[in-house]
């Protein structure tokens, strides 16, 4: 069985794409503000165009819409070392990012600190750094991996998780040592 | 429900030394990143530092660079603030939070805060 569709169903079904229902007649669906502008008036009526303008400096909006206000532009944040990549426009948010050589740590989905690629001193580069993440490094044999950096053995405490890298490298010496002695 | 506990507050003499603490509850500590936030007497709120879940990312405030040292203890569930140096404008209550995964606010949790007071 097929619900029967009253007339209010009617009012409030969706409008076609790009065009948005009237906020105060659900019965007229008004096109919707290009990208770069923001809704001013409605369409005060079926066929009418909508009163759309443009975004004013240090705004936005990226899609169509029907916004009362543009979006206020993000400003990049140097205390997390973030530079701009890209400026904002009236249809674009400003493109913040990292220097050359730094990746970006997200502490939230929108912040992020941008930080220094490990150079893998004392190792070698297993991934490349990426955008978002800091390079892979793997350790040369007498070091081990700490906080991404390569650290020698030396440095090792036995409470330490290093330990279990460190280790084999003690019992290939002894092993030569007692090999040397047959 | 998600508690944040932060003690090691008092009175102390600029260029003296404090150690905070923020006993955290109701939430896997070892999925979150934390930070430490303040708020001077008649001042907004102001971030201090954040530390990611195994410590390799750290975030210091200018004011505080060189000075203060964020750390954390995950089998204690416990986040610490060791501040050295102190002055009188780090005069502030300080608070304990917990950094949201989602969305454009950095913290979701705060605790109540300990007052600090650099004073001769």
């Known amino acids: 069985l097929v619900p029967h569709l009253g007339d209010r169903e009617k009012r409030d079904s969706v409008c076609p794409q790009g065009k948005y229902i009237h906020p105060q007649n659900n019965s007229i669906c008004c096109t919707k503000c290009h990208k770069g502008t923001y809704l001013y008036n409605d369409c005060p009526g079926p066929g009418q165009d909508t009163d759309c303008r443009e975004c004013e400096s240090g705004s936005f909006t990226a899609s169509e819409n029907h916004l009362r206000h543009c979006l206020s532009c993000s400003k990049c944040r140097k205390e997390m070392g973030q530079v701009e990549i890209s400026s904002c426009t009236v249809d674009r948010d400003t493109v913040c990012g990292c220097r050359k050589n730094q990746y970006r740590h997200y502490w939230s989905e929108n912040l992020f600190q941008c930080f220094n690629c490990s150079l893998c001193l004392n190792g070698t580069v297993h991934l490349s750094c990426q955008e978002k993440q800091n390079t892979v490094c793997t350790c040369h044999a007498g070091f081990f991996l700490r906080e991404n950096e390569c650290v020698s053995c030396s440095n090792c405490k036995k409470s330490l998780e290093c330990t279990k890298l460190c280790l084999p490298q003690i019992e290939n010496v002894k092993g030569t040592e007692d090999s040397g002695t047959t | 429900e998600v508690q944040l506990l932060e003690s090691g507050g008092g009175l102390v003499q600029p260029g003296g030394s404090l150690r905070l603490s923020c006993a955290a509850s109701?939430?896997?500590?070892?999925?979150?990143?934390m930070g430490w936030v303040r708020q001077a007497p008649g001042k907004g709120l102001e971030w201090v530092s954040m530390?990611?879940?195994?410590?390799?990312?750290?975030y210091y405030a200018d004011s505080v660079k060189g000075r203060f040292t964020i750390s954390r203890d995950n089998s204690k569930n416990t986040l610490y603030l060791q501040m050295n140096s102190l002055r009188a404008e780090d005069t502030a209550v300080y608070y304990c939070?917990?950094?949201?995964?989602?969305?454009?606010?950095?913290?979701?949790?705060w605790g109540q805060g300990t007052l600090v007071t650099v004073s001769s």
């Open positions: 939070a917990k950094i949201s995964q989602f969305g454009s606010n950095a913290f979701d949790y």
């Open positions: 109701g939430f896997t500590f070892t999925r979150y990143s």
């Open positions: 530390i990611d879940v195994p410590g390799n990312h750290t």
